[in-house]
Amino acid sequence: QEDEDGDYEELVLALRSEEDGLAEAPEHGTTATFHRCAKDPWRLPGTYVVVLKEETHLSQSERTARRLQAQAARRGYLTKILHVFHGLLPGFLVKMSGDLLELALKLPHVDYIEEDSSVFAQSIPWNLERITPPRYRADEYQPPDGGSLVEVYLLDTSIQSDHREIEGRVMVTDFENVPEEDGTRFHRQASKCDSHGTHLAGVVSGRDAGVAKGASMRSLRVLNCQGKGTVSGTLIGLEFIRKSQLVQPVGPLVVLLPLAGGYSRVLNAACQRLARAGVVLVTAAGNFRDDACLYSPASAPEVITVGATNAQDQPVTLGTLGTNFGRCVDLFAPGEDIIGASSDCSTCFVSQSGTSQAAAHVAGIAAMMLSAEPELTLAELRQRLIHFSAKDVINEAWFPEDQRVLTPNLVAALPPSTHGAGWQLFCRTVWSAHSGPTRMATAVARCAPDEELLSCSSFSRSGKRRGERMEAQGGKLVCRAHNAFGGEGVYAIARCCLLPQANCSVHTAPPAEASMGTRVHCHQQGHVLTGCSSHWEVEDLGTHKPPVLRPRGQPNQCVGHREASIHASCCHAPGLECKVKEHGIPAPQEQVTVACEEGWTLTGCSALPGTSHVLGAYAVDNTCVVRSRDVSTTGSTSEGAVTAVAICCRSRHLAQASQELQ
């Protein structure tokens, strides 16, 4: 990629002397931070992305870059500005000695600096066998337009655009930003260089083997012939897409990022900005048999992160490694022995495996959904992808034990029809990061900007927690869980829903003095109860059990332990109705569940009583799960009795609006 800001390409030893006087201190009380990849072999020391504060203008970015060069030159250091970012994130890419980091961090407008690092294609390399493409399956839903209203951007290797599968469907842009290949004797062989990208383009929109056969694609080269790229190259690619979008606005955009590197604050930030500009980003979870939250862009909350399963709905194993997992994965998709275009010849097919292939599947499904409903927001699309997925088909035993509860058991599927889902109240479960074990540690789970937080729960493997509560943060409700003394840490679990024109608030009742327990209800006219939370300051709640059955005629009420404060999530939205459903088991049981029936959506999930042997509650699809400590460790039978409380809602308004459309 030739830098548009050509002025900054030259090595600089000296600059106009007046530049030297510009080193004002950063704003009071703010300290710029330095970040680098946790995976040492993937670090690229000597190249740094200097990220400036959000409102910084291009001229200020250029001035800050010049200032850095001037001050570095005074100290006898060469620097080279490789790129000035604008349009997505303000900042610049600089080649310099690590000795200058302290100086750079003190520059005005600097928010943080990140050392560049490697990203990698997430397919295991091609099999050598030639394959014939699959036949069209009549039972598979094929919408007439096949994604034709959508443009899919592919950030990958170069591609063989004249392959019969993708000819005329993929426009190769002039964007290229790749590192040198490793090794002294590397020969660039076109078919090898194009292998990864060609295959993925075929999976998305190939004539025979593509998911969205009508989608048009644009390719950007950010991975070299060995499938290796850089965070900085990917950032510049994302910026290129944003600028293209501004210059020539088209219909819905999907960006496929079939690559992964170590956790990167700046790559995640760029993805967030692009997503908030209305672009749908789909990425590979990574092929490291590891927590996807440790990788980028997989860990970016705004990105749809896809893990890989095989034809038997098992997580894909790739030697010792395999698909990533965990709370940062949104869903899984087919990613083993996926047939697609081979760059060996213009009619060749090959099978490849990995989370890249899985992500390409989801990008294709997203293109189809967006083509049918071009006005869908990212939040709506994600909720639909989750809603139409096959549920509970993955064998969770493959995942590490501590990751099973966090990993979504969802395999992407095409909707039976792209219309008719509008009436549904869509909700998803969002897990926080682990709080850590310190006494006052908390964990926070957040919904996407255009989702409503309808309930909040918490979970701790040790059972030592102090509950959870919903609180306002930056004008939005978040779910915060509290660790307890001696606890190994907690998770906060948010139930995030699409509820247009909703007005939600939290009503709190402090711990009750009386032995009957604490109660709180939704007293505002037209507000219905969508979730209950409880939070306590005492280290260990006693065994007091409030009456499990709430009084008749008071469905809008949360009840809880007398030593806990109880929080009710109360919402008003057109046509919203909710009901409470309970399932109590008198004998000790490690897991109690209660599900909402067809046509109703689970919005709230909590446990009664909130005593210390309850590990917590969380929603899995439309089922409320309450987990208790191992029955062998709980005391008496009465102590072990637990009730799962589900709040099930539906929207008559959405149903009516949907019927009017049909």
């Epitope: 294609a121 390399p125 590397f186 020969h187 590891d290 790739l318 030697g319």
Partner: antibody, heavy 122, light 110 residues
Framework: QVQLVESGGGVVQPGRSLRLSCAAS????????MHWVRQAPGKGLEWVAL????????YYADSVKGRFTISRDNSKNTLYLQMNSLRAEDTAVYYC???????????????WGHGTTVTVSS | QSVLTQPPSVSAAPGQKVTISCSGS????????VSWYQQLPGTAPKLLIY???KRPSGIPDRFSGSKSGTSATLGITGLQTGDEADYYC???????????FGTGTRVTVL
């Protein structure tokens, strides 16, 4: 199941040549980098050579550079080590081992063969 | 001469914990992934730990790995007689452009 079987070892005189083979089965051979590692009698492990999954890059230990050549035939699922100008200090059990991942060759080795013995003696 | 240094031997009673150190430099352990291998008497080596602290499936969680700077450590808890073996650390060395193994440590269960 995943298996690597070495062959071609034997007794050879100093200065002579020997070619070791490693037959792979139970996995997609062309998707993984491959190593040769050796172990002299009563000694520790010594890395010998690495070849990338597609053969595009090869790396050698200084002790064998210029004398040994690593190669592979992905259509036959076989890895080779051509050993020329053999010396007494090349006497060892030679193991072939699979790289944990294709592009992340520096991760290490996850599957090992049982080894084949090479004795260089006059 | 190996560029990664390990203690020649460590020993402990059954059920106890042992740690094995592996010392290198910035060109190997400092900037590359560390793996640990177990070689039971008369057998081929077996991967125990990769990427500093990850266990392949089938390796019990009694085995753990960590890294600090240019050193790596293998920990074995709840020592069993079946753990008697030679243990090797290994990593890529960027300056040598090759893989390097540690000198090896013999673990004895008393």
């Amino acid at each position: 199941q995943v298996q690597l079987v070495e062959s071609g070892g034997g007794v050879v005189q100093p200065g002579r040549s020997l070619r070791l083979s490693c037959a792979a089965s139970g996995f997609t051979f062309s998707s993984f980098g491959m190593h040769w590692v050796r172990q002299a009698p009563g000694k520790g492990l010594e890395w010998v050579a690495l070849i990338w999954n597609d053969g595009s890059n090869k790396y050698y230990a200084d002790s064998v550079k210029g004398r040994f050549t690593i190669s592979r035939d992905n259509s036959k699922n076989t890895l080779y080590l051509q050993m020329n100008s053999l010396r007494a200090e090349d006497t060892a059990v030679y193991y072939c081992a699979r790289a944990i991942a294709a592009l992340y060759y520096y991760y290490g080795m996850d599957v090992w063969g049982h080894g084949t013995t090479v004795t260089v003696s006059s | 001469q190996s560029v990664l240094t390990q203690p020649p031997s460590v020993s402990a009673a059954p059920g106890q914990k042992v740690t094995i150190s592996c010392s290198g430099s910035s060109s190997n352990i400092g900037n590359n992934f560390v793996s640990w291998y177990q070689q039971l008497p008369g057998t081929a080596p077996k991967l125990l730990i990769y990427d500093y602290n990850k266990r392949p499936s089938g390796i019990p969680d009694r085995f753990s790995g960590s890294k600090s700077g240019t050193s790596a450590t293998l920990g074995i808890t709840g020592l069993q007689t079946g753990d008697e073996a030679d243990y090797y650390c290994g990593t890529w060395d960027s300056s040598l452009s090759g893989y390097v193994f540690g000198t090896g440590t013999r673990v004895t269960v008393l």
